[in-house]
Interface confidence: low
């Protein structure tokens, strides 16, 4: 059994009189013998739970769940009820109605077994039949909506008559009927006004019902007619097998570069009619198994549950359904020389299912793992400019196809061949896999005699020990320029472009600053600023390099704070900011501030 | 203006009763609820008891039940407590307050300090 | 009955300093939250209701805001005459209960 609302209103007056009756409530069946039987809770509770008072003035007839007044309410009881709700003049009340012989603790009030009827009270008398209005004395003031569970025996599930009105406006006809298109599964009862299901309804041809009721009053020579919306949900049952779509049971997948722990190899999806169990129950109750193989491939292999709740037309209608995507998930990074071929099943278990036919389905997923050799092509010629300063990026090197590898730690060493002219160094990139060649020490790039620089390039995955060589054949161009007097440390300090330009700083590959501008554009990611090379600072991004001494690009990688109107970047840095943004590392401080368009002679003047 | 006054405290032995009363003056006294509120020294405020406007209705807070018993005569526009089985814990100025319609105590009277020692 | 746990307990700070206490309730009260102001020998004064509200009265540089479980009382200009004490009170359900108070003092 189960109510058809999970709340019910109505209003009440002082001094209505004992007997009037308020309202019925309605359930319906789960199972054709089933026969409802009313009770109802022991408390009055308030608008916020409180509990107001033991209800001594309303009762139920438990067979057909009519509401009614046992005793008036007076004003001395009316006080007593708005006393403990801290004196509000006009106070809603509600009670509990639970269906025999469910055993709900009184406390606990949740549909389909228990219902809340709530009363809005009027510390006046019942009005005048002539002056009410006619939606008055038609619906409710607030409307109600139905909830029908797909696949039960039809029943009776509303009674439209106001039952106040009707006990103290004899006098008034009020009719009703149903505005609905053809062969829907409704009837109104003209005598009754009792409205019912024709049928079992399905979720799954449809699942919201948006009729229209009609009510005409009577009343003398008038004649008024009332519409209101008359919404109902038909709610969902496990009555839907798990099906694939276009019937693909079965993903191939390659692991190669892709050997990371978490990455998702394939993707098999399941498609279910129904919409429960609900998402907080699914993954308890919707199961799915990655069936005993070799022990190699429970280890290296999980299977991850995604449902989605996504919409399919019926009958010209969208109804609600359920796609789960399944996916076969690496359980741990793969080292590169491991080297496989399987099949892995799973078994997919709708566990709520009834029938007919079965909640089960065997997904397959066939998975090649490849090897993977390490490769770098046999020489890298490279130049540099004599004036470069300590950590300028000059280039990359990169193994073979190192841009598509993730779960594989390569490591790149330089080995140089020329005495006393080690002036590179070599950091392994985290993010692509690559390794970043920058300038170690720039006094041996003045040397006459390390004019042409060769190295050895040794890529090692850390896991294996494999390793891979390369020839790096570096030239070092230009003649050294020293630096100007009084240039700071960092190119992020200067705000103008005429400083920046002046100056070289750490992490500048030509010797001097680039001056990036800005597009003016507000709070934006392309900011005025003056950096070491703009191909590597800002660009929203602390790399491996820059991560070696904070003057580099602190416009990337400071932590510290950052003034005026900016974004912040995700950890560190300016994602976004106002104007021109300079830095001054050794205070871990930014500004980003208007652009200065003053004349430098005026500048200089003011000095 | 509204003006709450309690009498009634003094130096009491444990086991002992008191009676604390509270005149009210300024407002209508049958409308609205009427609350004590202690504060033992050096420590916060406690909510005692409260009385519905009509007296029919009393509240207590749950270690008073028994002990303590709120009344208020509408006719004299005073508010009662008599405290009996007194214990030394129950030392503390006792305030009367009104209660505003919508539940906070909007005015206080000044205080009355019962003690409670052998 | 609903706790009330008021935090800090003690708070120093200065003239035109901006001061926030705040209140936890052990359950949902709803918006139903009083915040009160005692001096030394003094009976409490409400400050605040309904978790927002300004009683007539009290200055503008009072103010509370919070619903159901956390709320919040926040001076925002520290003047002499508000160092006291501050009390927060659930008001939805009998026994009304306080919270333990914080001690606001001169630094």
């Known amino acids: 059994l189960y109510f058809s609302r999970d709340a019910y209103w109505e209003k009440l007056y002082v001094d209505q009189a004992a007997g009037t009756p308020l309202l019925y409530v309605h359930a319906l069946r789960d199972a054709p013998e089933e026969v409802p039987s009313f009770r109802l809770g022991q408390h009055l509770y308030g608008t916020y739970r409180t509990r107001l008072h033991e209800n001594n003035w309303i009762c139920i007839q438990e067979d057909t769940g009519l509401l009614y007044l046992n005793r008036s309410l007076d004003h001395s009881s009316w006080e007593k009820l708005s006393v403990r709700n801290r004196g509000f003049p006009l106070l809603t009340v509600y009670l509990k109605v639970f269906l025999s012989p469910t055993s709900l603790r009184e406390g606990e009030c949740q549909w389909p077994g228990c219902a809340r009827v709530y009363f809005s009270f009027f510390n006046t008398s019942f009005p005048a039949c002539s002056s009410l209005k006619p939606r008055e004395l038609c619906f409710p003031e607030t409307r109600p909506s139905f909830r029908i569970r797909e696949n039960r025996p039809p029943g009776t599930f509303h009674q439209f008559r106001l039952l106040p009105v009707q006990f103290l406006c004899p006098n008034i006809s009020v009719a009703y009927r149903l505005l609905e298109g053809e062969g829907l599964p409704f009837r109104c009862a003209p005598d009754s006004l009792e409205v019912s299901t024709r049928w079992a309804l399905d979720r799954e041809q449809r699942e919201k019902y948006e009729l229209v009721a009609v009510c005409t009053v009577h009343a003398g020579a008038r004649e008024e007619v009332v519409m209101v919306p008359f919404p109902v949900t038909v709610y969902d049952e496990d009555d839907s097998a798990p099906t694939f779509p276009a019937g693909v049971d079965t993903a191939s997948a390659v692991v190669e570069f892709k050997r990371k722990e978490d990455t998702v190899v394939a993707t098999l999806r399941v498609f279910d009619a129904d919409v429960v169990p609900a998402s907080g129950e699914l993954v308890r109750r919707y199961t799915s198994t990655l069936l005993p193989g070799d022990t190699w491939a429970q280890q290296t292999f999980r299977v991850e549950h995604w449902p989605n709740e996504t919409s399919v037309q019926a009958n010209g209608s969208f109804v609600r359904a359920t796609v789960h995507d399944y996916r076969l998930v690496l359980n741990r990074n793969l080292s590169i020389s491991e080297n496989r071929t399987m099949q892995l099943a799973v078994l997919v278990n709708d566990s709520d299912f009834q029938g007919p036919g079965a909640g089960v389905l065997l997904l397959h997923f066939n998975v090649s793992v490849l090897p993977v050799s390490l490769h770098l092509p046999s020489t890298y010629s490279l130049s540099v400019s004599r004036r470069a300063r300590r950590f300028a990026q000059i280039g990359k090197v990169c193994v073979e196809n190192c841009q598509a590898f993730s779960g594989i730690n390569v490591q790149y060493k330089l080995h140089s061949s020329g005495a006393n002219c080690s002036t590179l160094g070599v950091v392994t990139s985290a993010e692509d896999t690559s390794g970043i060649l920058f300038v170690n020490d720039t006094k041996a790039l003045r040397r006459p005699k390390c004019a042409e620089l060769h190295y050895m390039v040794v890529a090692t995955d850390q896991q294996t020990s494999r390793q891979a060589q390369a020839q790096l054949l570096v030239t070092v161009e230009g003649s050294y320029v020293a630096e100007e007097a009084g240039c700071p440390l960092s190119c992020a300090v200067s705000k103008r472009r005429l400083e920046c330009e002046e100056c070289g700083g750490l992490g500048s590959p030509t010797g001097r600053c680039e001056w990036r501008q800005g597009d003016g554009k507000g709070i934006t990611r392309n900011f005025s600023t003056c950096s070491p090379s703009t191909k590597t600072c800002p660009d929203g991004h602390c790399d491996v390099v820059e991560t070696q001494d904070i003057n580099i690009c602190p416009q990337d990688c400071l932590r510290g704070s950052i003034v005026g109107g900016h974004e912040p970047g995700e950890p560190r840095g300016i994602k976004a900011g106002y104007g021109t943004c300079n830095c001054f590392p050794e205070e871990e401080k930014c500004f980003c501030e208007p652009e200065d368009i003053q004349d430098p002679l005026c500048d200089e003047l003011c000095r | 203006e509204v003006q709450l006054v309690e009498s009634g405290g003094g130096l009491v032995q444990p086991g002992g009763s008191l009676r604390l009363s509270c005149a009210a003056s300024?407002?209508?006294?049958?409308?609205?609820?009427m609350s004590w509120v202690r504060q033992a020294p050096g420590k916060g405020l406690e909510w005692v008891s409260g009385i519905s406007g009509s007296g029919t209705s009393t509240f207590y807070v749950d270690s008073m039940k028994g002990r303590f018993t709120i009344s208020r005569d509408n006719s004299k526009n005073t508010l009662y407590l008599q405290m009996n089985s007194l214990r030394v814990e129950d030392t503390a100025v006792y305030f009367c307050?009104?209660?505003?319609?919508?539940?906070?105590?909007?005015?206080w009277g000044q205080g009355t300090l019962v003690t409670v020692s052998s | 009955d609903i706790q009330l746990t008021q935090s800090p307990s003690f708070l120093s700070a200065s003239v035109g300093d901006r001061v926030t206490i705040t209140c936890w309730a052990s359950q949902d009260i709803s918006s139903h939250l009083a915040w009160y102001q005692q001096k030394p020998g003094k009976a409490p004064k409400v400050l605040i209701y309904?978790?927002?509200t300004l009683q007539s009265g009290v200055p503008s540089r009072i103010s509370g805001s919070g619903s159901g479980t956390e709320f919040t009382l926040t001076i925002s200009s520290l003047q002499p005459e508000d160092f006291a004490a501050y009390y927060c009170?659930?008001?939805?359900?009998?026994?009304?209960?306080f919270g333990q108070g914080t001690k606001l003092e001169i630094k």
């Open positions: 009170q659930q008001l939805d359900g009998y026994p009304y209960t």
């Open positions: 300024g407002f209508t006294f049958t409308t609205y609820f």
């Open positions: 309904d978790a927002s």
């Open positions: 307050a009104k209660e505003n319609t919508y539940g906070h105590f909007d005015f």
